[in-house]
């Protein structure tokens, strides 16, 4: 990212390019790869965010058991379409003409099949289970500090709504944090939770998408939180569909 | 004051390759995007794509994927637009401008003329 | 990509007269700040003006006859009194997303 002028950058999306040709002259900052302007006081959606990643010049626990029907990103990296808002297209189709569904993560919902692939609706995933794992430490985190701090920096840093952080479960050495968020629930302004788990998981892998913060310092009353883990389950309102063969692999 | 200055006229054969150039003054270079545009003989406007000189970002009308290429050279102000393989239909007037949408200022066009 | 459709493709009015041309996108290119749509004169012979930027937002130097409005999907040019200056093509053009493409362009003549 290069800053067009004092001050015309993004604060929220380093995966821009800002320049001083906006309405009245002011900055405006566009998205790499799609072109598309970003508001920087919010977080980018993941779909704009992948698309310029793409395009850049590179038993009784207290801990949740994901559901059959939750998804793991297995796929990768891939250069999605995005609608006129920023957030993924229901199909998403690569170079070779293979096609899938995905849902409001991008993270794909169904076999892939041929240009002939039907994708009625972008189905929202309406709960994320984040699963940690910290590095050893001397003892145990006190867990309503870990839960404090958790909640605290989803609030702050990714801006996103108390009320969307249903639970933080702690059972050393593993976190998981629940977010959960229905369509109904979200109202025009709020962030979405998938685009928040998204920023997170990058902070986590020291890849924050911040403009020059530092990386994410995680400390629970002083003591260093380092992940050496991630895992992220994602739950969809209506289930995916996958033939019997996948689900038997 | 603000200016673009592109490079003069080309006639090429088809096949071949052509370089525009556009030298930009009166402003710093490096803070706007440059954006590229042609326009067929009697014909409306066409995107092509657009750079960012101080990084070098670009963007490309996928019609001009694989063909066009913008490149900028920072310490002389002047973006370049080549377009390779050129075919009788590329015959048009090739405008730099200064901004993404919205070129506010323009330079004063290129004629590319492709014949045998 | 995103196709833009101006109407009329000429239109012939008299001197003083007020001169509307219209341009659709084929999806909305607003937020609820901005419109991401622009509008240029070209004279035959010479390059694209900038006339307005972000819809209605004049640009510096051009005469105060001409205005922008719309939002959405739906934006008008208006020239209030026409002059015989103003005799040109005048085109639109969206900075939504990639390819920022223009209208086909509305030829504007003196009756």
């Known amino acids: 990212h290069t800053a067009a002028q004092d001050n015309c950058t993004c604060p929220t999306n380093k995966m821009t390019v800002c320049s001083p040709d906006g309405p009245g002259g002011r900055c405006q900052c566009r998205a790499l790869g799609s072109g598309m302007a970003v508001d920087c006081s919010t977080l980018t959606s993941k779909c704009l965010l992948l698309k310029a990643r793409m395009s850049a010049p590179k038993n009784a626990r207290t801990l949740v058991r994901p559901s059959e029907h939750a998804l793991v990103d297995n796929d990768g990296l891939y250069d999605p379409d995005c609608d006129p808002e920023g957030r993924f297209k229901a199909r998403q189709c690569n170079q070779t003409s293979v096609c899938w569904c995905v849902n409001s993560v991008g993270v794909r919902r169904t076999d892939k099949g041929d240009l002939s692939l039907r994708c009625d609706e972008l189905v929202r995933t309406h709960h994320i289970l984040i699963d940690l794992r910290h590095r050893p430490t001397a003892g145990a985190f006190n867990h309503s500090d870990l839960d404090a701090e958790l909640r605290r920096l989803f609030r702050e840093r990714y801006r996103l709504h108390p009320k969307f952080v249903a639970a933080v479960h702690y059972e050393q050495p593993t976190i998981q944090i629940e977010l959960r968020q229905n369509t109904s629930q979200k109202a025009a302004g709020d962030v979405d939770i998938g685009d928040a788990a998204y920023y997170f998981e990058r902070d986590i892998k020291g890849e924050s998408l911040f403009q020059g913060r530092g990386g994410l310092d995680l400390r629970v009353r002083g003591e260093p939180l380092q992940v050496e883990r991630t895992l992220i389950y994602y739950l969809d309102e209506i289930p995916p569909k996958f033939s019997m063969k996948r689900l038997t692999a | 004051q603000v200016q673009l200055v592109q490079s003069g006229a080309e006639v090429k054969k088809p096949g071949a390759s052509v370089k525009v150039s556009c030298k930009a003054s009166g402003y710093t270079f490096t803070n706007y995007w440059i954006g590229w545009v042609r326009q067929a003989p009697g014909q409306g406007l066409e995107w092509i794509g657009d750079i960012y000189p101080g990084g070098g970002y670009t963007n490309y009308n996928e019609k001009f994927k694989g063909r066009a290429t913008l490149t900028a050279d920072t310490s002389t102000s002047t973006a370049y637009m080549e377009l390779s393989s050129l075919r009788s239909e590329d015959t048009a007037v090739y405008y730099c401008a200064r901004g993404t949408g919205g070129g506010d200022y323009w330079g004063q066009g290129t004629l590319v003329t492709v014949s045998s | 990509d995103i196709v833009m459709t101006q109407s009329p493709d000429s239109l012939a009015v008299s001197l003083g007269e007020r001169a509307t041309i219209n341009c659709r996108a084929s999806q909305s290119v607003s937020t609820s700040s901005y419109s991401y749509m622009h509008w240029y004169q070209q004279k035959p012979g010479q390059p694209p003006k900038l006339l307005i930027k972000?819809?209605?937002n004049l640009e510096s130097g051009v005469p105060d006859r001409f205005s922008g409005s719309g939002s959405g999907t739906d934006f008008t040019l208006t020239i209030s009194s026409l002059q015989a200056e103003d005799v040109a093509v005048y085109y639109c053009?969206?900075?939504?997303?990639?390819?920022?493409?223009f209208g086909q362009g509305t030829k504007l003549e003196i009756k």
């Open positions: 053009q969206h900075s939504w997303e990639i390819p920022y493409t």
């Open positions: 972000y819809a209605s």
